[in-house]
Protein backbone atom coordinates (compact mmCIF):
# COMPACT_ATOMS: atom_id res chain seq x y z
CA UNK A 1 0.00 0.00 0.00
CA UNK A 2 1.69 3.53 -1.28
CA UNK A 3 1.41 6.44 1.24
CA UNK A 4 -0.40 9.38 -0.17
CA UNK A 5 2.60 11.16 -0.56
CA UNK A 6 3.74 8.51 -3.05
CA UNK A 7 0.41 8.09 -4.74
CA UNK A 8 0.44 12.06 -4.95
CA UNK A 9 4.04 11.75 -6.37
CA UNK A 10 2.70 8.53 -9.04
CA UNK A 11 -0.15 10.95 -10.04
CA UNK A 12 1.88 13.75 -11.21
CA UNK A 13 4.21 11.26 -13.38
CA UNK A 14 0.99 9.64 -14.90
CA UNK A 15 0.17 13.40 -15.58
CA UNK A 16 3.71 14.21 -17.46
CA UNK A 17 2.98 11.59 -19.91
CA UNK A 18 -0.28 12.17 -20.79
CA UNK A 19 -1.46 13.68 -24.03
CA UNK A 20 -4.63 15.38 -24.10
CA UNK A 21 -6.72 16.76 -27.03
CA UNK A 22 -7.19 20.57 -26.58
CA UNK A 23 -8.84 23.00 -29.44
CA UNK A 24 -6.41 24.97 -31.29
CA UNK A 25 -9.48 28.05 -31.40
CA UNK A 26 -10.62 27.65 -27.99
CA UNK A 27 -13.42 30.26 -28.46
CA UNK A 28 -15.11 31.49 -31.91
CA UNK A 29 -14.05 35.15 -32.69
CA UNK A 30 -16.56 37.75 -31.89
CA UNK A 31 -19.83 37.69 -34.36
CA UNK A 32 -19.05 34.02 -34.50
CA UNK A 33 -21.76 31.43 -33.07
CA UNK A 34 -20.51 28.35 -31.37
CA UNK A 35 -22.41 25.07 -33.10
CA UNK A 36 -20.87 21.81 -31.09
CA UNK A 37 -16.70 21.89 -32.80
CA UNK A 38 -17.49 24.83 -35.52
CA UNK A 39 -17.78 28.69 -35.45
CA UNK A 40 -20.54 30.15 -37.68
CA UNK A 41 -20.83 33.36 -39.22
CA UNK A 42 -23.87 34.32 -40.85
CA UNK A 43 -23.98 36.82 -43.18
CA UNK A 44 -25.68 39.88 -42.75
CA UNK A 45 -25.29 40.79 -46.30
CA UNK A 46 -26.33 39.21 -49.43
CA UNK A 47 -24.24 37.69 -52.40
CA UNK A 48 -24.26 35.16 -55.40
CA UNK A 49 -22.61 31.93 -53.84
CA UNK A 50 -19.27 32.85 -55.66
CA UNK A 51 -18.70 35.91 -53.81
CA UNK A 52 -20.25 34.47 -50.71
CA UNK A 53 -17.75 31.78 -51.36
CA UNK A 54 -14.84 34.31 -51.60
CA UNK A 55 -15.43 36.36 -48.52
CA UNK A 56 -15.73 33.21 -46.50
CA UNK A 57 -12.02 32.85 -47.75
CA UNK A 58 -11.29 36.13 -46.83
CA UNK A 59 -12.10 35.32 -43.09
CA UNK A 60 -10.07 32.36 -43.21
CA UNK A 61 -12.93 30.03 -42.97
CA UNK A 62 -15.40 28.10 -45.80
CA UNK A 63 -18.65 28.43 -46.71
CA UNK A 64 -20.56 25.78 -44.91
CA UNK A 65 -20.21 22.21 -44.47
CA UNK A 66 -23.29 20.29 -43.03
CA UNK A 67 -22.15 16.65 -41.86
CA UNK A 68 -25.79 14.85 -41.76
CA UNK A 69 -29.15 15.65 -41.02
CA UNK A 70 -28.36 16.69 -36.93
CA UNK A 71 -26.16 19.05 -38.32
CA UNK A 72 -28.36 20.65 -39.87
CA UNK A 73 -30.99 20.81 -38.03
CA UNK A 74 -28.61 22.30 -35.52
CA UNK A 75 -27.61 25.04 -37.69
CA UNK A 76 -31.49 25.84 -38.92
CA UNK A 77 -32.37 26.25 -35.17
CA UNK A 78 -29.86 29.69 -35.67
CA UNK A 79 -32.03 30.72 -38.08
CA UNK A 80 -34.76 33.50 -36.73
CA UNK A 81 -36.73 34.48 -39.74
CA UNK A 82 -37.79 31.62 -41.98
CA UNK A 83 -38.05 33.62 -45.24
CA UNK A 84 -34.65 33.82 -45.48
CA UNK A 85 -32.19 32.15 -47.08
CA UNK A 86 -28.04 31.41 -46.22
CA UNK A 87 -25.89 30.03 -48.77
CA UNK A 88 -23.66 26.62 -47.64
CA UNK A 89 -20.65 25.29 -49.55
CA UNK A 90 -22.89 22.60 -51.76
CA UNK A 91 -23.03 23.36 -55.53
CA UNK A 92 -24.03 21.29 -58.34
CA UNK A 93 -21.50 19.90 -60.54
CA UNK A 94 -21.81 19.48 -64.08
CA UNK A 95 -18.88 17.22 -65.30
CA UNK A 96 -19.84 14.90 -62.45
CA UNK A 97 -23.81 14.72 -62.18
CA UNK A 98 -24.06 15.05 -58.60
CA UNK A 99 -24.32 17.76 -55.67
CA UNK A 100 -20.53 18.42 -54.74
CA UNK A 101 -19.31 19.86 -51.15
CA UNK A 102 -16.43 22.62 -51.88
CA UNK A 103 -14.30 20.24 -49.77
CA UNK A 104 -14.64 17.54 -52.45
CA UNK A 105 -16.66 15.23 -51.53
CA UNK A 106 -20.51 14.44 -52.77
CA UNK A 107 -23.58 14.10 -51.04
CA UNK A 108 -24.71 11.74 -49.29
CA UNK A 109 -28.23 11.29 -50.82
CA UNK A 110 -29.91 11.14 -47.68
CA UNK A 111 -27.98 13.86 -45.76
CA UNK A 112 -30.31 16.47 -47.24
CA UNK A 113 -33.50 16.19 -48.84
CA UNK A 114 -33.24 18.92 -50.98
CA UNK A 115 -36.44 21.26 -52.67
CA UNK A 116 -35.31 22.12 -56.39
CA UNK A 117 -33.78 20.85 -59.42
CA UNK A 118 -30.70 19.65 -59.52
CA UNK A 119 -28.81 21.24 -62.52
CA UNK A 120 -26.17 23.01 -64.05
CA UNK A 121 -25.42 27.16 -62.36
CA UNK A 122 -27.64 25.36 -58.82
CA UNK A 123 -26.52 26.18 -55.72
CA UNK A 124 -27.91 25.12 -52.19
CA UNK A 125 -29.26 27.32 -49.70
CA UNK A 126 -30.75 26.42 -46.78
CA UNK A 127 -33.67 28.39 -44.50
CA UNK A 128 -35.24 27.68 -40.96
CA UNK A 129 -37.58 24.95 -42.43
CA UNK A 130 -35.74 23.83 -45.74
CA UNK A 131 -33.01 23.08 -47.76
CA UNK A 132 -33.51 24.33 -51.48
CA UNK A 133 -31.94 24.85 -54.50
CA UNK A 134 -31.37 28.11 -56.14
CA UNK A 135 -29.64 30.08 -59.37
CA UNK A 136 -26.14 30.61 -57.72
CA UNK A 137 -26.04 34.26 -58.71
CA UNK A 138 -29.01 34.74 -56.67
CA UNK A 139 -28.13 37.14 -54.21
CA UNK A 140 -28.87 35.74 -50.68
CA UNK A 141 -27.10 35.71 -47.24
CA UNK A 142 -24.93 33.07 -46.88
CA UNK A 143 -22.86 30.80 -43.59
CA UNK A 144 -19.12 30.97 -43.35
CA UNK A 145 -17.82 28.08 -40.61
CA UNK A 146 -13.68 27.93 -38.94
CA UNK A 147 -13.27 24.21 -37.48
CA UNK A 148 -12.51 23.86 -34.26
CA UNK A 149 -9.92 21.79 -34.80
CA UNK A 150 -8.19 19.65 -32.37
CA UNK A 151 -4.31 19.87 -31.28
CA UNK A 152 -2.47 17.50 -29.58
CA UNK A 153 -0.56 19.42 -26.68
CA UNK A 154 1.40 17.69 -23.58
CA UNK A 155 0.27 18.92 -20.27
CA UNK A 156 2.69 19.17 -17.57
CA UNK A 157 0.16 20.14 -14.53
CA UNK A 158 2.27 22.13 -11.57
CA UNK A 159 2.66 19.52 -9.19
CA UNK B 1 -50.16 46.26 -41.59
CA UNK B 2 -48.50 45.46 -44.73
CA UNK B 3 -49.83 47.80 -47.68
CA UNK B 4 -49.20 47.74 -51.44
CA UNK B 5 -51.42 50.48 -53.64
CA UNK B 6 -51.02 50.35 -56.82
CA UNK B 7 -51.79 52.70 -59.76
CA UNK B 8 -51.03 54.46 -63.15
CA UNK B 9 -53.55 52.28 -64.90
CA UNK B 10 -56.02 53.53 -67.83
CA UNK B 11 -56.65 53.31 -71.07
CA UNK B 12 -53.64 53.29 -73.68
CA UNK B 13 -53.85 52.62 -77.51
CA UNK B 14 -52.05 49.69 -79.17
CA UNK B 15 -48.45 50.26 -79.41
CA UNK B 16 -48.65 52.62 -76.65
CA UNK B 17 -47.03 52.67 -72.83
CA UNK B 18 -47.86 53.10 -69.39
CA UNK B 19 -46.01 53.04 -66.17
CA UNK B 20 -47.39 51.66 -63.33
CA UNK B 21 -46.92 52.35 -59.36
CA UNK B 22 -46.79 50.54 -56.30
CA UNK B 23 -46.41 52.75 -53.26
CA UNK B 24 -45.63 50.11 -49.94
CA UNK B 25 -45.82 50.58 -46.50
CA UNK B 26 -45.77 48.81 -43.27
CA UNK B 27 -42.61 46.86 -43.81
CA UNK B 28 -38.81 46.96 -44.63
CA UNK B 29 -39.15 47.88 -48.56
CA UNK B 30 -35.85 47.42 -49.43
CA UNK B 31 -35.11 43.90 -48.06
CA UNK B 32 -37.81 42.65 -50.15
CA UNK B 33 -37.92 41.19 -53.41
CA UNK B 34 -41.09 42.23 -55.63
CA UNK B 35 -43.12 41.07 -58.02
CA UNK B 36 -46.18 42.09 -60.44
CA UNK B 37 -48.69 39.43 -61.30
CA UNK B 38 -51.83 40.45 -63.96
CA UNK B 39 -54.91 38.72 -64.64
CA UNK B 40 -56.89 39.48 -68.04
CA UNK B 41 -60.55 40.15 -67.43
CA UNK B 42 -62.07 36.56 -66.84
CA UNK B 43 -58.89 34.99 -66.79
CA UNK B 44 -56.05 33.32 -64.95
CA UNK B 45 -53.39 35.38 -62.95
CA UNK B 46 -49.44 35.67 -64.44
CA UNK B 47 -46.50 36.34 -63.30
CA UNK B 48 -44.83 38.97 -65.19
CA UNK B 49 -41.77 40.37 -63.31
CA UNK B 50 -39.51 40.67 -60.65
CA UNK B 51 -36.85 42.74 -59.29
CA UNK B 52 -34.36 42.09 -56.23
CA UNK B 53 -34.60 44.09 -52.91
CA UNK B 54 -31.26 45.87 -54.33
CA UNK B 55 -32.99 46.26 -57.58
CA UNK B 56 -29.66 44.78 -58.99
CA UNK B 57 -31.58 41.56 -60.35
CA UNK B 58 -34.96 42.02 -62.49
CA UNK B 59 -36.33 39.17 -63.81
CA UNK B 60 -39.41 38.65 -66.48
CA UNK B 61 -41.89 36.21 -68.21
CA UNK B 62 -41.05 35.49 -71.89
CA UNK B 63 -44.11 37.24 -72.87
CA UNK B 64 -42.94 41.19 -71.77
CA UNK B 65 -39.24 40.84 -72.31
CA UNK B 66 -37.99 43.40 -74.17
CA UNK B 67 -41.17 45.95 -73.62
CA UNK B 68 -41.73 46.27 -69.67
CA UNK B 69 -39.11 47.11 -67.08
CA UNK B 70 -39.31 46.89 -63.49
CA UNK B 71 -37.45 49.02 -61.44
CA UNK B 72 -37.95 50.35 -57.69
CA UNK B 73 -37.28 53.59 -56.12
CA UNK B 74 -36.34 52.58 -52.02
CA UNK B 75 -36.06 55.31 -50.95
CA UNK B 76 -39.58 56.47 -51.73
CA UNK B 77 -40.89 52.64 -50.90
CA UNK B 78 -42.38 52.84 -54.56
CA UNK B 79 -42.10 49.86 -57.26
CA UNK B 80 -42.55 50.47 -61.32
CA UNK B 81 -43.78 48.93 -64.18
CA UNK B 82 -42.53 50.61 -67.39
CA UNK B 83 -44.55 49.02 -70.44
CA UNK B 84 -43.86 49.76 -73.85
CA UNK B 85 -44.98 48.32 -77.08
CA UNK B 86 -48.23 47.71 -75.36
CA UNK B 87 -50.42 44.64 -77.40
CA UNK B 88 -54.14 43.54 -77.09
CA UNK B 89 -52.95 40.80 -74.72
CA UNK B 90 -51.60 42.74 -72.11
CA UNK B 91 -54.78 44.48 -70.91
CA UNK B 92 -55.29 43.02 -67.82
CA UNK B 93 -55.59 43.78 -64.00
CA UNK B 94 -51.84 44.61 -62.66
CA UNK B 95 -51.44 43.31 -59.30
CA UNK B 96 -48.19 44.13 -57.25
CA UNK B 97 -46.96 41.74 -54.97
CA UNK B 98 -44.33 40.93 -52.47
CA UNK B 99 -41.96 37.82 -52.56
CA UNK B 100 -42.45 35.76 -49.59
CA UNK B 101 -38.27 35.73 -48.99
CA UNK B 102 -36.18 38.08 -48.77
CA UNK B 103 -33.72 40.23 -50.91
CA UNK B 104 -33.63 38.35 -54.06
CA UNK B 105 -36.20 36.31 -56.34
CA UNK B 106 -36.53 33.14 -55.06
CA UNK B 107 -37.39 29.67 -57.21
CA UNK B 108 -38.97 28.38 -54.52
CA UNK B 109 -41.21 32.11 -53.63
CA UNK B 110 -44.83 32.82 -52.94
CA UNK B 111 -46.60 36.05 -52.43
CA UNK B 112 -47.66 36.35 -49.50
CA UNK B 113 -49.16 40.84 -49.70
CA UNK B 114 -51.04 41.77 -52.60
CA UNK B 115 -52.44 45.08 -53.78
CA UNK B 116 -55.63 45.77 -55.27
CA UNK B 117 -54.75 46.15 -58.57
CA UNK B 118 -54.79 48.47 -61.19
CA UNK B 119 -56.38 48.45 -64.71
CA UNK B 120 -54.85 48.70 -67.83
CA UNK B 121 -57.03 48.38 -70.91
CA UNK B 122 -55.48 48.38 -74.33
CA UNK B 123 -57.81 49.51 -77.23
CA UNK B 124 -58.25 51.52 -80.43
CA UNK C 1 -52.47 26.88 -71.72
CA UNK C 2 -50.77 26.59 -68.25
CA UNK C 3 -48.17 24.21 -67.39
CA UNK C 4 -50.10 23.68 -64.15
CA UNK C 5 -53.59 22.04 -65.05
CA UNK C 6 -56.40 22.60 -62.52
CA UNK C 7 -60.19 21.09 -63.05
CA UNK C 8 -62.30 24.53 -64.05
CA UNK C 9 -64.93 23.96 -61.47
CA UNK C 10 -65.57 21.81 -58.36
CA UNK C 11 -68.42 21.83 -55.77
CA UNK C 12 -69.49 20.84 -52.62
CA UNK C 13 -72.49 21.22 -49.79
CA UNK C 14 -71.70 22.96 -46.82
CA UNK C 15 -69.43 21.09 -44.12
CA UNK C 16 -68.51 18.60 -47.32
CA UNK C 17 -64.74 18.24 -47.78
CA UNK C 18 -63.60 19.02 -51.31
CA UNK C 19 -60.28 18.28 -52.72
CA UNK C 20 -58.78 20.47 -55.66
CA UNK C 21 -55.92 19.07 -57.84
CA UNK C 22 -52.94 20.67 -59.82
CA UNK C 23 -51.22 18.29 -61.96
CA UNK C 24 -47.36 19.66 -63.33
CA UNK C 25 -44.51 17.61 -64.69
CA UNK C 26 -40.97 16.73 -64.35
CA UNK C 27 -40.23 20.54 -64.79
CA UNK C 28 -41.92 22.02 -62.14
CA UNK C 29 -43.62 20.60 -59.55
CA UNK C 30 -41.81 17.09 -60.02
CA UNK C 31 -38.37 18.76 -60.23
CA UNK C 32 -38.53 18.88 -56.38
CA UNK C 33 -40.40 22.97 -56.70
CA UNK C 34 -42.38 24.22 -53.69
CA UNK C 35 -46.22 24.41 -54.63
CA UNK C 36 -48.31 27.54 -53.26
CA UNK C 37 -51.94 28.14 -53.21
CA UNK C 38 -54.01 31.57 -53.10
CA UNK C 39 -58.08 31.83 -52.92
CA UNK C 40 -59.45 34.64 -54.88
CA UNK C 41 -63.22 36.38 -54.02
CA UNK C 42 -64.86 37.89 -56.55
CA UNK C 43 -64.36 41.38 -57.22
CA UNK C 44 -60.65 40.91 -54.82
CA UNK C 45 -56.97 41.11 -55.25
CA UNK C 46 -55.41 36.88 -54.31
CA UNK C 47 -54.98 35.79 -50.80
CA UNK C 48 -52.15 33.53 -49.76
CA UNK C 49 -53.78 30.22 -48.17
CA UNK C 50 -50.64 27.95 -48.49
CA UNK C 51 -46.86 27.90 -49.07
CA UNK C 52 -43.91 25.77 -49.49
CA UNK C 53 -46.77 23.05 -50.24
CA UNK C 54 -48.59 22.33 -47.17
CA UNK C 55 -47.84 25.57 -44.46
CA UNK C 56 -50.57 27.92 -43.61
CA UNK C 57 -49.92 31.46 -43.09
CA UNK C 58 -51.12 32.92 -39.52
CA UNK C 59 -55.16 33.36 -40.10
CA UNK C 60 -56.11 30.76 -42.35
CA UNK C 61 -58.15 28.25 -40.83
CA UNK C 62 -56.66 24.59 -40.30
CA UNK C 63 -59.84 23.76 -43.07
CA UNK C 64 -57.26 24.54 -45.48
CA UNK C 65 -54.51 22.04 -46.11
CA UNK C 66 -51.88 21.50 -48.74
CA UNK C 67 -49.89 18.40 -49.71
CA UNK C 68 -47.53 17.32 -52.80
CA UNK C 69 -46.39 14.12 -54.31
CA UNK C 70 -44.75 13.60 -57.27
CA UNK C 71 -45.93 15.56 -60.15
CA UNK C 72 -49.46 17.10 -58.69
CA UNK C 73 -50.36 18.73 -55.95
CA UNK C 74 -53.97 19.29 -53.65
CA UNK C 75 -55.55 21.59 -51.91
CA UNK C 76 -58.30 19.80 -49.48
CA UNK C 77 -61.01 22.40 -48.21
CA UNK C 78 -62.93 20.60 -44.77
CA UNK C 79 -66.01 21.94 -43.39
CA UNK C 80 -67.05 23.70 -46.80
CA UNK C 81 -68.33 27.31 -45.80
CA UNK C 82 -70.57 29.65 -48.33
CA UNK C 83 -67.64 31.62 -48.22
CA UNK C 84 -64.91 29.58 -49.43
CA UNK C 85 -67.09 29.82 -52.51
CA UNK C 86 -63.72 31.79 -54.88
CA UNK C 87 -61.31 30.78 -57.39
CA UNK C 88 -58.30 28.98 -56.43
CA UNK C 89 -54.81 28.92 -58.22
CA UNK C 90 -51.95 27.01 -57.27
CA UNK C 91 -48.47 28.55 -58.32
CA UNK C 92 -44.88 26.74 -59.00
CA UNK C 93 -41.79 27.45 -60.50
CA UNK C 94 -40.66 26.16 -64.18
CA UNK C 95 -38.07 27.01 -66.36
CA UNK C 96 -36.68 30.23 -65.09
CA UNK C 97 -40.09 32.04 -63.77
CA UNK C 98 -42.99 31.84 -61.58
CA UNK C 99 -46.13 29.37 -62.97
CA UNK C 100 -49.68 29.85 -62.23
CA UNK C 101 -52.47 27.19 -62.60
CA UNK C 102 -55.76 27.66 -64.94
CA UNK C 103 -57.54 28.10 -61.83
CA UNK C 104 -60.42 26.29 -60.46
CA UNK C 105 -63.93 27.33 -59.29
CA UNK C 106 -65.30 26.61 -55.97
CA UNK C 107 -68.94 26.45 -55.40
CA UNK C 108 -70.95 25.97 -52.59
CA UNK C 109 -74.03 24.50 -53.84
Known amino acids: QKSSIEKCSVDIQQSRNKTTERPGLLNCPIYWQQLREKCLLFSHTVNPWNNSLADCSTKESSLLLIRDKDELIHTQNLIRDKAILFWIGLNFSLSEKNWKWINGSFLNSNDLEIRGDAKENSCISISQTSVYSEYCSTEIRWICQKELTPVRNKVYPDS | EVQLVESGGGLVQPGGSLRLSCAAS????????MSWVRQAPGKGLEWVSAISGSGRSTYYADSVKGRFTISRDNSKNTLYLQMNSLRAEDAAVYYC?????????????????WGQGTLVTVSS | QSVLTQPPSVSGAPGQRVTISCTGGSSNIGAGYDVHWYQQLPGTAPKLLIYGNSDRPSGVPDRFSGSKSGTSASLAITGLQAEDEADYYC?????????FGGGTQLTVL
Open chain 3, 91 to 99: QSYDSGHTV
Open chain 2, 97 to 113: ARDYYLYDYITQTSFDY
Open chain 2, 26 to 33: GFTFSSYA
